[in-house]
């Protein structure tokens, strides 16, 4: 089972408030995107597995001066048990693949949605 901010998935329970807010922020970013997100900045792709929150933060923290994802960065830090600083990398990064921040956010959102639906949809 994948631990998702305080509950196990699959399972018939909705997310914690903090995780719900993260999902909503990712939705806001993807739906309200007008110009290229973070000026088209590229970040390391990650393996969307058990430690994905820390890995996502480690990837996104290297993007500076982008107000659109600052809230997401703060939220992700709440799900990562250790302090993350720029330039830090874990084994969860796909080090040979860089993608745009917009795609990174979309992939993360899609993965979270899949995780929640797993417990409810057959």
């Amino acid at each position: 089972l994948t631990c998702l901010g305080g509950f196990a998935s699959p399972g018939p329970v909705p997310p914690s408030t903090a995780l719900r807010e993260l999902i909503e922020e990712l939705v806001n970013i993807t739906q309200n995107q007008k110009a290229p997100l973070c000026n088209g900045s590229m970040v390391w792709s990650i393996n969307l597995t058990a430690g994905m929150y820390c890995a996502a933060l480690e990837s996104l923290i290297n993007v500076s001066g982008c107000s659109a994802i600052e809230k997401t960065q703060r939220m992700l830090s709440g799900f990562c048990p250790h302090k993350v600083s720029a330039g830090q990398f874990s084994s969860l990064h796909v080090r040979d693949t860089k993608i745009e921040v917009a795609q990174f956010v979309k992939d993360l959102l899609l993965h979270l949605k899949k995780l929640f639906r797993e417990g409810q949809f057959n």
């Epitope: 909705p14 899949k114 409810q120 949809f121």
Partner: antibody
Framework: QVQLVQSGADVKKPGASVKVSCKAS????????IHWVRQAPGQGLEWMGA????????AYNQKFKGRATLTADKSTSTAYMELRSLRSDDTAVYYC????????????WGQGTLVTVSS | EIVLTQSPATLSLSPGERATLSCRAS??????LHWYQQKPGQAPRLLIY???QSISGIPARFSGSGSGTDFTLTISSLEPEDFAVYYC?????????LGGGTKVEIK
């Protein structure tokens, strides 16, 4: 703007099947679940089930399991609800509605499709 | 299955009066409760989500409160167009369930 447009009213005989369509527009179809809710004349709202158009995964109200089938066609952004072995008490208005994730609210609704089951 | 019980079944009030609608869940659903309004011949319309969150385009006279098992929809001052049936919905877990509705009628 977001729209869910349903097929027209239908009259069926007991024991027959009905298939109601729901065409989505104004948003990315695979980003939202499609849920089906029905309302018998003068009665309240009853949730029937849901489909994730991206994967085809479904969830059903136990009451309709085995009798209802939910499908979605990504190429046409259309969801379908088929109900078999119709009875007179299946006479109702059937609504499709979208939900981002199951715990979200139903923010947009189709106009409803009246299905009348009568001999 | 989470059962939602709405009360009263019918509320007879005059325009300008305050309407208080109740919805009680059979078990704790946190704030995963949504409210809808339905007028005759129309599809339901979302009013309030997550128990108290307002929807853009919905008049400020509609407000929601509560958490756990007890929830309230309040219409601060009834307008003629507010006379309708109101439903609460459980968003906590499948099967999604709805209350039996409260009809707000003109006194």
């Amino acid at each position: 703007q977001v729209q869910l447009v349903q097929s027209g009213a239908d009259v069926k005989k007991p024991g027959a099947s009905v298939k109601v369509s729901c065409k989505a527009s104004g948003y990315t179809f695979i980003d939202y679940e499609i849920h089906w809710v029905r309302q018998a004349p003068g009665q309240g709202l009853e949730w029937m089930g849901a489909i994730d158009p991206e994967t085809g995964g479904t969830a059903y109200n136990q009451k309709f399991k085995g009798r209802a089938t939910l499908t979605a066609d990504k190429s046409t952004s259309t969801a379908y609800m088929e109900l078999r072995s119709l009875r007179s008490d299946d006479t109702a208005v059937y609504y499709c509605t979208r939900i981002l994730l199951y715990y979200y609210p139903m923010d947009y609704w189709g106009q409803g499709t009246l299905v009348t089951v009568s001999s | 299955e989470i059962v939602l019980t709405q009360s009263p079944a019918t509320l007879s009030l005059s325009p300008g009066e305050r309407a208080t609608l109740s919805c009680r869940a059979s078990q704790n659903i946190s704030d995963y409760l949504h409210w809808y309004q339905q007028k005759p011949g129309q599809a339901p319309r979302l009013l309030i989500y997550y128990a108290s969150q307002s929807i853009s385009g919905i008049p400020a006279r509609f407000s929601g409160s509560g958490s756990g098992t007890d929830f309230t929809l309040t219409i601060s001052s009834l307008e003629p167009e507010d006379f309708a049936v109101y439903y609460c919905q459980n968003g906590h877990s499948f099967p999604l369930t709805l209350g039996g509705g409260t009809k707000v009628e003109i006194k």
